[in-house]
């Protein structure tokens, strides 16, 4: 059995040149004739040189999975799906996203260090000593309140709560 060159495919014991992206094999090569290719029908594609008898079906972006169509399918490129705002891609296969997850909400005591994008989750960071955050979408930790000379510190601040001052 012969081993075919790159971008050739085996038919019986003959190697045939592959079709161009956007096409599929209509008729395999023969002794005198090269591979005859045909354009991919609508909603199908081939992204690479290929020996396929049928083009591949275009992907569908499922809104129930948090997906929206970012780039329509063409004869040589699959549909590109992206996550809806507020979600990021959990399963990425090349340029194709299959499932999305909601961006993490930073817990109390943390701030948003990096906002979530369509392909990356939110990155949270701890508040430094002397600052606090209630969490959520807060990008900066707030400094603890300094009780005034006429106030008494009842409870020291934590990374998630402010200092509590009393007026007595």
């Amino acid at each position: 059995q012969p081993s075919c060159r790159q971008e050739e495919f085996l038919v019986g014991d003959e190697c045939c040149p592959m079709c161009n992206p956007g096409y599929h094999v209509k008729q395999v090569c023969s002794e005198h004739t090269g591979t005859v290719c045909a354009p991919c029908p609508p909603q199908t594609y081939t992204a690479h040189a290929n020996g396929l008898s049928k083009c591949l079906p275009c992907g569908v972006c499922d809104p129930d999975m948090g997906l929206l169509t970012w780039q329509e399918c063409s004869s040589w490129k699959d549909t590109v799906c992206r996550c809806i705002p507020g979600y990021f891609c959990e399963n990425q296969d090349g340029s194709h996203c299959s499932t999305c997850l909601q961006h993490t909400t930073c817990p109390p005591g943390q701030r948003v260090e990096k906002r979530g994008t369509h392909d990356q989750d939110t990155v949270c960071a701890d508040c430094l000593t002397g600052t606090f955050s209630l969490g959520g979408t807060q990008e900066e930790c707030l400094p603890w309140t300094n009780c005034s000379a006429f106030q008494q510190e009842v409870r020291r601040g934590t990374n998630s709560t402010d200092t509590t001052c009393s007026s007595q």
Epitope: P17, Y23, T33, G34, C37
Partner: antibody, heavy 117, light 108 residues
Framework: EVQLLESGGGLVQPGGSLRLSCAAS????????MHWVRQAPGKGLEWVSS????????DYADSVKGRFTISRDNSKNTLYLQMNSLRAEDTAVYYC??????????WGQGTLVTVSS | EIVLTQSPGTLSLSPGERATLSCRAS??????LAWYQQKPGQAPRLLIY???NRASGIPDRFSGSGSGTDFTLTISRLEPEDFAVYYC??????????FGQGTKVEIK
């Protein structure tokens, strides 16, 4: 000897139309795939379109897709190329050629198409 | 599409000399490559098909070799009538059918 004779070329304005014909003789026209190949002045060869013997399969170059239509009449031994929405870059000598799929074993002498205002 | 690159662009030789023309494909075309000769004001003429088969009526000083991506047209001894432009063309995967940009063989 195989003979292919193109006609229908000429001067046409951008956006205009032209229909080229290729009269074939001295071979069984209905048994062969036929092709159009063009050559811009001083440039190389560019495949334009192909049609199989029974018109069951037709191909076009991307540069002419949607504007040009290849057809044949086996009873008249004639190949046609209907050219619409012509552009300056379509200016070329248009050759009709006989052959198996993708191979051109006999060529006509060509007809010049000039697209200019 | 498969791109064919011919080299050199121009070959300056004397009658009786050997001419070697190259055609390289951007990806494999198998054995499905043809060579054509074109003289000024004339239609192209098929010389070689399937990489190495001479077309009907072509003198045996013309020979073709190669497969896959690298092909060569050799004219063993140049005759005065051989000075012309030579084109390679692939039909390994079509459409589209593609031609090389041509090599001009001129008298030195």
């Amino acid at each position: 000897e195989v003979q292919l004779l193109e006609s229908g070329g000429g001067l046409v304005q951008p956006g205009g139309s032209l229909r080229l014909s290729c009269a074939a003789s001295e071979f069984t026209f209905s048994s062969y795939a036929m092709h159009w190949v063009r050559q811009a002045p001083g440039k190389g060869l560019e495949w334009v379109s192909s049609i199989t013997s029974a018109s069951s399969y037709i191909d076009y170059a991307d540069s002419v897709k949607g504007r040009f239509t290849i057809s044949r009449d086996n009873s008249k031994n004639t190949l046609y190329l209907q050219m619409n929405s012509l552009r300056a870059e379509d200016t070329a000598v248009y050759y009709c050629a006989r052959g198996t799929r993708g191979l051109f074993d006999h060529w006509g002498q060509g007809t010049l198409v000039t697209v200019s205002s | 599409e498969i791109v064919l690159t011919q080299s050199p662009g121009t070959l300056s030789l004397s009658p009786g000399e050997r001419a070697t023309l190259s055609c390289r494909a951007s990806r494999s075309v198998g054995k499905y490559l043809a060579w054509y000769q074109q003289k000024p004001g004339q239609a192209p003429r098929l010389l070689i098909y399937l990489g190495s088969n001479r077309a009907s009526g072509i003198p045996d000083r013309f020979s073709g070799s190669g497969s896959g991506t690298d092909f060569t047209l050799t004219i063993s001894r140049l005759e005065p009538e051989d000075f012309a432009v030579y084109y390679c063309q692939q039909y390994g995967s079509s459409p589209p059918i593609t031609f090389g940009q041509g090599t001009k063989v001129e008298i030195k």
